[in-house]
């Protein structure tokens, strides 16, 4: 672990569990990028005062990275060559291949609200296709 603790959304929340989950996750939505390029996956938790203890990034239930309030970032060994932490609680994917196409999830572990999940669909396009503007619209 690099022990650089990130700037966490959510303050030092307290209180008991079973609360109403008022928060919402805003994401970059559906995005596309060129093969060989890079892309930033971003989520933002808003409308809650819950304390964020950890954010997990997953691709089809496979863990990519963890950002922990105490420990900072951990990148899964199988992705460490192509995944970079940040900016913020986001994740940067590098050297994209068509196999990176799919759904990505940011999972916010919070107290007392519990887990919030945001989803982003990434399509990795061949360079020639990307140049001709066949892109998803960001909502």
């Amino acid at each position: 672990y690099p022990y650089d603790v990130p700037d966490y959304a959510g303050g030092g929340g307290s209180g008991g569990g079973g609360s109403m989950m008022t928060g919402t996750i805003e994401t970059t939505g559906n995005i596309s990028a060129e093969k060989g390029g890079s892309i930033i996956l971003q989520c933002h938790l808003s409308s809650t005062t819950a304390q964020v203890t950890q954010v997990n990034w997953e691709q089809q239930d496979q863990l990519l990275a963890i950002c922990n309030a105490d420990l900072g970032w951990h990148i899964s060994p199988s992705f460490k060559d192509r995944v970079a932490p940040g900016p913020g609680l986001g994740l940067t994917l590098q050297s994209l291949t068509v196999n990176d196409t799919g759904e990505y999830a940011c999972i916010y572990h919070t107290y007392p609200d519990g887990t919030y999940t945001g989803r982003i669909f990434l399509e990795v396009l061949e360079s020639s296709v990307a140049e001709h503007g066949a892109r998803f619209q960001i909502p």
């Epitope: 304390q51 239930d61 963890i66 105490d70 420990l71 007392p112 519990g114 887990t115």
Partner: antibody, heavy 119, light 107 residues
Framework: EVQLVESGGGLVQPGGSLRLSCAAS????????MHWVRQAPGKGLEWVAF????????YYADTVKGRFTISRDNAKNSLYLQMNSLRAEDTAVYYC????????????WGQGTMVTVSS | DIQMTQSPSSLSASVGDRVTITCRAS??????LAWYQQKPGKAPKLLIY???TLQSGVPSRFSGSGSGTDFTLTISSLQPEDFATYYC?????????FGGGTKVEIK
């Protein structure tokens, strides 16, 4: 090999205090959140408290809030549970358990230490 | 708090049987459910987490499924060492809560 060994249990009178310890070995203790879970005789499991790896997040079950205090000493690879104002209903086997790095459940448990609250 | 209800509370089965245990949450917990096995006088052992992910070292005859409020633990072919009590536990929000347990006994 991951090992968690609890100690400090025993017989105590209602209103008394006890301090449980959990000695961890076989992993980098300072990287993992830790829990205390208890089990009353012949009953099911009840989560008691959690402390994050660096102690920035501490949570308690409502049944023990204000009476129990969870703490840790990463330099000593140790987890603690200070139990005050003990009641008969606190009688149970107390387990310490490690939280998975991804925060998805408790992957290793100690063998437990028995706490009996009785006059 | 989220209530976890397990059924049945006990069952009798024979070696080689397929066994299914269900767990229902009082509100949606997404995929965040774990299953534990406990033998008398021993600590619980993690079998499944996040609904369906097998913990390292756990035999593949154990499997988990479900999401939202309804979950299932299946033992495809019961072995002698599988006779124990099984607990479900939600790890979606604090306080983490457990089901009442299902005791699997020898028929």
């Amino acid at each position: 090999e991951v090992q968690l060994v609890e100690s400090g249990g025993g017989l105590v009178q209602p209103g008394g205090s006890l301090r449980l310890s959990c000695a961890a070995s076989g992993f980098t203790f300072s990287n993992f959140g830790m829990h205390w879970v208890r089990q009353a005789p012949g009953k099911g499991l009840e989560w008691v408290a959690f402390i994050s790896s660096g102690s920035s997040s501490i949570y308690y079950a409502d049944t023990v809030k204000g009476r129990f205090t969870i703490s840790r000493d990463n330099a000593k690879n140790s987890l603690y549970l200070q139990m005050n104002s003990l009641r008969a209903e606190d009688t149970a086997v107390y387990y310490c358990a490690r939280m998975r790095l991804d925060y998805y459940a408790m992957d290793y448990w100690g063998q437990g230490t028995m706490v009996t609250v009785s006059s | 708090d989220i209530q976890m209800t397990q059924s049945p509370s006990s069952l009798s089965a024979s070696v080689g049987d397929r066994v299914t245990i269900t767990c229902r949450a009082s509100k949606s917990i997404s995929k965040y459910l774990a299953w534990y096995q406990q033998k008398p006088g021993k600590a619980p052992k993690l079998l499944i987490y996040s609904g369906s992910t097998l913990q390292s070292g756990v035999p593949s005859r154990f499997s988990g499924s479900g999401s939202g409020t309804d979950f299932t633990l299946t033992i495809s072919s019961l072995q002698p060492e599988d006779f124990a009590t099984y607990y479900c536990q939600q790890h979606n929000e604090y306080p983490w809560t457990f089901g009442g347990g299902t005791k699997v006994e020898i028929k």
